[in-house]
Interface confidence: medium
C-alpha cells in the first residue's frame, strides 16, 4: 500500500519540499499534539456492559514503543443485576494507527511504516444467527 | 527516545534511540486492511450503543479519511428496543498517529501527528456526583 | 460443508435427566466456541450454554446454571448437553450451535440441522 500524492492540480508542489530519494519519504517522528491526552468517561472500561482489560505491549524496535490493547472480559454483557448474560455478546471495537518500525540488516538500520491495529474497548451487540444448512 | 539492544560488532556511531527524522520506504507494511468500518463490522447498528460514523477528510493527511463516531443516544438500547436513560451510551475515544504532509503540500515529508478519534460507543452505568 | 446434527432429546418426567449430543462437521470443531441454544413454542432463540474452543471457559444462562453441564469431546468432533433436574419450561427445541468466524468473536453464529425436541411433562 502507497502513500498516495497529493492528487489534487490546485496542490502545486511548494519549491520549499525538502529532497527524497525514490521510494522513499522523509519522517519527523517529533509527535504534532504529544501532549494531548484522552479524556474518556472516568473507569469506562470497568462501568460499561461489556467490560474490559487494557494490556500493554513493548516492543524497543517500534515507535511508539507502548501500545495499549483492550481484551474483552466476558462473552457476554452484563444485565441490570450484574449478571453476565450470553444472549448478548461483548465484541471488541478496533482502530488502524500507524507506528515505525525500525528494521536491521546487519549494521544498517532501516525504517518501515506499519499500520497495526489496535483493540479500543468493547461494546455489547445483539447476535446475528446464521442458518447453515 | 527507546533504547535497543545493538549488535556488538556494529561501529558505535548509531544511535540506541530513534532519530527525530527518519527516511522511511514508501510502502506501508502490515494490511491492506479494509478501513470503512461501515464495512468491516456492523457493531455501529447491533450495539445496544449504537453509533452514526462521520467520514473526516483531509488531503494534507495520511489516512486522508478517518471515520468518527458519534452516539446516536444519549442512553442504551434496551432487551426491547427502547432507550434506556438509566444508562449511558459514550464514546470511546483513541489516540492514534497519522501522517501530516510538512511543509504542507510537499508530496514525500510528512510528520508523525497524534489525533484522538471516536472509534465505537460502549454503555455504561452512570456515576452520579451529590454536589451539595 | 458445515454440518450440525443434534439428537438425544425426548419425553422426560419433571425432575428427569437427558444427555444431548451434537455432531459436527465441515470445519476444525477444536478452533471453535461452541454453544447450545433453545427455541420454545412461540419464542424466539435463547442462548443457554457456551464453551469454549479447549474446554477451559464455560458459561451458562440463569435459566439454567447448577441443572445444565456442557461438554466437548474434541477428537469426536462433538457437543453435549447434560440436563439434570428438568422443568415444565425446559421443553424447547435445542440446537447446537458456533462461531461463524474463528479466532475473533463478532457476535455472529451458525446454527444448524433440525435441532433435537425435548419435552418435560407428566
Known amino acids: 500500500r502507497k502513500i498516495p500524492k497529493v492528487g489534487h492540480t490546485f496542490f502545486q508542489k511548494p519549491e520549499s519540499c525538502p529532497p527524497v530519494p525514490g521510494g522513499s519519504m522523509k519522517l519527523d517522528i517529533g509527535i504534532i499534539n504529544e501532549n494531548q491526552r484522552v479524556s474518556m468517561s472516568r473507569n469506562i472500561e470497568s462501568r460499561s456492559t461489556s467490560p474490559w482489560n487494557y494490556t500493554v505491549t513493548w516492543d524497543p524496535n517500534r515507535y511508539p514503543s507502548e501500545v495499549v490493547q483492550a481484551q474483552c472480559r466476558n462473552l457476554g454483557c452484563i444485565n441490570a443485576q450484574g449478571k453476565e448474560d450470553i444472549s448478548m455478546n461483548s465484541v471488541p471495537i478496533q482502530q488502524e494507527t500507524l507506528v515505525v518500525r525500525r528494521k536491521h540488516q546487519g549494521c544498517s538500520v532501516s525504517f518501515q511504516l506499519e499500520k497495526v491495529l489496535v483493540t479500543v474497548g468493547c461494546t455489547c451487540v445483539t447476535p446475528v444467527i446464521h442458518h447453515v444448512q | 527516545g527507546i533504547t535497543i539492544p545493538r549488535n556488538p560488532g556494529c561501529p558505535n556511531s548509531e544511535d540506541k534511540n530513534f532519530p527525530r527524522t527518519v527516511m522511511v520506504n514508501l510502502n506501508i507494511h502490515n494490511r491492506n486492511t479494509n478501513t470503512n468500518p461501515k464495512r468491516s463490522s456492523d457493531y455501529y447498528n447491533r450495539s445496544t450503543s449504537p453509533w452514526n460514523l462521520h467520514r473526516n477528510e483531509d488531503p494534507e493527511r495520511y489516512p486522508s479519511v478517518i471515520w468518527e463516531a458519534k452516539c446516536r443516544h444519549l442512553g442504551c438500547i434496551n432487551a426491547d428496543g427502547n432507550v434506556d436513560y438509566h444508562m449511558n451510551s459514550v464514546p470511546i475515544q483513541q489516540e492514534i498517529l497519522v501522517l501530516r504532509r510538512e511543509p504542507p503540500h510537499c508530496p514525500n515529508s510528512f510528520r508523525l501527528e497524534k489525533i484522538l478519534v471516536s472509534v465505537g460507543c460502549t454503555c455504561v452505568t452512570p456515576i452520579v456526583h451529590h454536589v451539595a | 460443508e458445515v454440518q450440525l446434527v443434534e439428537s438425544g432429546g425426548g419425553l422426560v418426567q419433571p425432575g428427569g435427566s437427558l444427555r444431548l449430543s451434537c455432531a459436527a462437521s465441515?470445519?476444525?470443531?477444536?478452533?471453535?466456541?461452541m454453544y447450545w441454544v433453545r427455541q420454545a413454542p412461540g419464542k424466539g432463540l435463547e442462548w443457554i450454554s457456551a464453551?469454549?474452543?479447549?474446554?477451559?471457559?464455560?458459561y451458562y444462562a440463569e435459566s439454567v446454571n447448577g441443572r445444565f453441564t456442557i461438554s466437548r469431546d474434541n477428537a469426536k468432533n462433538s457437543l453435549y448437553l447434560q440436563m439434570n433436574s428438568l422443568k415444565s419450561e425446559d421443553t424447547a427445541v435445542y440446537y447446537c450451535?458456533?462461531?461463524?468466524?474463528?479466532?475473533?468473536?463478532?457476535?455472529?453464529?451458525?446454527?444448524g440441522g433440525q435441532g433435537t425436541q425435548v419435552t418435560v411433562s407428566s
Open positions: 465441515g470445519f476444525t470443531f477444536s478452533s471453535y466456541w
Open positions: 464453551l469454549a474452543p479447549g474446554g477451559g471457559n464455560r
Open positions: 450451535a458456533k462461531d461463524h468466524n474463528v479466532g475473533y468473536r463478532t457476535g455472529e453464529y451458525d446454527y
